[in-house]
Interface confidence: medium
């Protein structure tokens, strides 16, 4: 399937102009290659009419141009002074020959309709209303006023001043006069449909002295706006229906042959195909709203329509807006697992892609909630502190420059199952959706910490060990101290990794962390985890409480100041421990002024422009070590 996209059908009238936009995938080659517009002949040949190389055919001379917009990945073909001879099948495309990637466009140029010379033309969109102005002479002021619609043979009454109304206009047509002006009457017709289009005659008085006026009412279906989006990216449908429907229920539907199937509405209806990846957000009191869909699939391509009606369903005669969505399968967004599976008590590490050109953008992770119109409250971000209910078990690791950040959630419960979104305050196309499934654990976790009830005594030495299976032997093990700004990885060195090993003793693989001497600031959550390069794996968490020597009551200190620590390698005497320098990490003051704005993605997180560095270093200075026991043969 060609990744080029444009309008399928373009219709215009003689003497008028058209501007046709064609979209192409965002690659350097595409931006620089030849763009063309050619006309398809009966033989299947496509004859170039204009190209970006400067070619212009004789029949387009002086009336057409082609402009490339590499920054938008589009090119535009402008054609003026259209004639009926321009009606036909065309292609807009890319490539050195006209057999390259292309999109078929049908252009129809019709004759200007013949109208009586005094005809007033009103052009309105479906669902809107029109007020027709009907002037008359003073002598006809006392006479009957009327509006009729011309049919083949006669003129069928719409409404008159004696309050006669055609059944199909009941509740939609009003005849009135303004103030003391006795030379004009008005007819307002609301909830316009295609059937209302046509010629009308306003009349005041009867017989030869009657005042008559011809009116041509054109009722247009909205021209679909073209949306070109990458597979797995996101799209926002911005719907602006006007103040007159501000209080009506809103919907977005997708055309399916003759019907339009509702995908989401403000009354709580939602298509199961879009579960976890759609939000509808009211914008203001003027009837504006937006629908955001993430994780675009091939099958999402199609014709969409938004509208408003008390039923939350499409209704003839109500305003609509339409889009044609094209999903480009040559996506720049990497193909990642859309379903992540975890077990109760275990952990998941979710790799979130972002636009590598925007490595300094703020990264977020939110949980999609389907109640109401759907919303996505932020749980963690590079400058958004972890939500309280996720204390000690959620952290975001930013890896600047490689187009990925990682979110780790541990101590999983079945309630964590659901949909989560990766997003940044940068390129909104890179929003991705992950479904987290949590099953009941059927075996022991891979990582286990001992002792499990960890209470350290102030001023003494305290060691915790993290046991891991042989399958993690070659992976990097780490301990980190959790804070609501991230999990600060403690410096470590892996003794066993430097030794040759013939076999692996399942019972003796461990990485230890020693606090020496224990201070009050050491209280809190610690994680033991494994990773391979920048790819994070499993984690387990432990809360270390700190008590006075007197065994007094334990006091949880939420602050996370810099602390001094000495580190002991597992199974070595404490006195030979390596003394770490104090780590004076400067806590980030957090210039995230608009923090509240970003906490709910229902309000378009990418609009938040706060900037700053990730506040993941929490100022702790700790070290951990790994010791492996080997059997030498």
């Amino acid at each position: 399937k060609s990744p080029i996209f444009g309008p399928q059908e373009v219709s215009s009238i003689e003497g008028d102009s058209v501007s046709i936009t064609c979209y192409y995938p965002d690659t350097s080659v595409n931006r620089h290659t030849r763009k063309y517009w050619c006309r398809q002949g009966a033989s299947g040949m496509c004859t170039t009419l204009i190209s970006s190389n400067g070619y212009l055919s004789k029949e387009y001379s002086g009336r057409a141009n082609l402009i490339n917009f590499p920054e938008n990945n589009t090119f535009v073909i402008n054609i003026e002074q259209l004639t009926q001879d321009d009606t036909g099948s065309y292609k807009c495309g890319l490539g050195t020959s006209n057999r390259g990637l292309s999109f078929d466009v049908s252009l129809e140029v019709s004759q200007v309709p013949e109208l009586p010379s005094d005809t007033h033309v009103y052009t309105k969109d479906i669902g809107r209303n029109v007020t027709i102005e009907c002037p008359f002479k003073r002598e006809n002021a006392p006479s009957k006023k009327s509006l009729c619609k011309k049919t083949n043979q006669s003129c069928e009454l719409v409404i008159d001043s004696t309050e006669k109304v055609n059944p199909s206009y009941i509740g939609r047509a009003k005849l009135f006069m303004k103030g003391t002006d006795l030379t004009v009457f008005y007819v307002n017709i609301s909830h316009l449909t295609h059937n209302d289009a046509g010629l009308y005659i306003c009349q005041a008085g009867e017989g030869p002295s009657a005042d008559k006026k011809n009116v041509d009412l054109q009722v247009l279906a909205p021209e679909p706006e073209l949306l070109y989006k990458d597979l797995r990216s996101s799209v926002t449908f911005e719907c602006d229906l006007g103040r007159e429907v501000a209080n009506e229920a809103k919907y977005l539907c997708r055309m399916n042959k003759e019907t339009c199937d509702v995908i989401i509405n403000t009354l709580g209806k939602r298509d199961p195909d879009f579960e976890g990846r759609i939000l509808i957000t009211p914008k203001d009191d003027n009837g504006r709203f937006s629908v955001l869909i993430t994780g675009l699939r091939k099958e999402d391509a199609g014709h969409y329509q938004c509208g408003a009606h008390s039923s939350g369903l499409p209704q003839e005669g109500w305003p609509i807006q339409t889009w044609q969505l094209f999903v480009n399968e040559e996506s720049t967004i990497p193909n990642r697992r859309s379903v992540v599976k975890g077990v109760t008590g275990g952990s998941v590490a979710i790799a979130c892609p972002y636009n590598p050109k925007e490595s300094s953008s703020l990264k977020y992770w939110c949980r999609w909630e389907g109640d109401g119109n759907g919303h996505c409250p932020v749980l963690v971000g590079t400058q958004a502190q972890v939500q309280e209910e996720y204390e000690g078990r959620l952290a975001l690791f930013d890896q600047p420059g490689n187009g990925t950040y990682t979110v780790i959630l541990n101590q999983l419960t079945t309630e964590d199952a659901g949909f989560y979104w990766c997003l940044t305050n940068g390129d909104s196309r890179w929003r991705t959706t992950i479904e987290l499934q949590v099953a009941e654990a059927t075996r022991e976790p891979n990582l286990e910490v001992t002792p499990q009830n960890a209470t350290a005594v102030l001023g003494e030495t305290f060691t915790v060990s993290c046991h891991y299976p042989c399958k993690f032997y070659s992976q990097e093990k780490y301990w980190c101290k959790w804070s609501n700004k991230g999990c600060h990885i403690l410096p470590s060195h892996d003794e066993g990794a430097r030794q040759s090993s013939v076999s692996c003793d399942q019972s003796s693989q461990l990485v230890s962390m020693t606090l020496n001497p224990v201070s009050k600031e050491d209280e809190g959550w610690y994680w033991c985890g494994v990773k391979q390069g920048q790819t994070y794996g499993e984690t387990t968490a432990i809360y270390i409480a700190v008590e006075e020597r007197t065994r007094g009551s334990s006091h949880v200190n939420p602050t996370d100041a810099n602390a001094r620590a000495k580190v002991a390698l597992e199974e070595e005497v404490v006195d030979s421990s390596i003394s770490e320098k104090e780590n004076k990490a400067i806590p980030n003051p957090g210039p995230f002024a608009n923090e509240r704005e970003i906490q709910n993605v229902g309000d378009q997180a990418q609009e938040n422009r706060a900037s700053g560095d990730a506040g993941s270093a929490d100022g702790q200075s700790r070290s951990s070590s790994s010791k492996h026991h080997h059997h030498h043969h």
Partner: nanobody, 127 residues
Framework: QVQLVESGGGLVQAGGSLRLSCAAS????????MGWFRQAPGKERDLVAV????????SYADSVKGRFTIARDNANARLYLEMTSLKPEDTAIYYC????????????????????WGQGTQVTVSS
């Protein structure tokens, strides 16, 4: 996208004249079809006049035909609306608008066809 800034609005007596100007910034002004729209209080935004990308085609609302003239200067990225014989019913906020997608015909008269808008300039015609 093109950015648009209108100027030239003000208070004028019925029968008087005004010239509105719209300055465009951004790339390739000459590839955009341009329009002037107006919105009176409590009314919807209505098209006043449009001009195609090259200036070769113009179109006017019936209510302003013969009184208003739309023109463009592609070299300086400017759009103009010359308004003469002004009437009190011309009172409104006037907006400059641009679009690249354009299928001509009656569709030229629809605000929905235009994707870039200025902030507007107030024109008040007193009787």
């Amino acid at each position: 996208q093109v950015q648009l800034v209108e100027s030239g609005g003000g208070l004028v007596q019925a029968g008087g004249s005004l010239r509105l100007s719209c300055a465009a910034s951004g790339r390739s002004f000459s590839s955009y079809n341009m329009g002037w729209f107006r919105q009176a209080p409590g009314k919807e935004r209505d098209l006043v006049a449009v001009v195609t990308w090259s200036g070769g085609g113009t179109s006017y609302a019936d209510s302003v035909k013969g009184r208003f003239t739309i023109a463009r200067d592609n070299a300086n990225a400017r759009l103009y609306l010359e308004m003469t014989s002004l009437k009190p019913e011309d009172t409104a906020i006037y907006y400059c608008a641009a679009t690249q997608d354009w299928y001509g015909g009656t569709r030229a008269f629809r605000a929905a066809s235009f994707h870039s808008w200025g902030q507007g300039t107030q024109v008040t015609v007193s009787s």
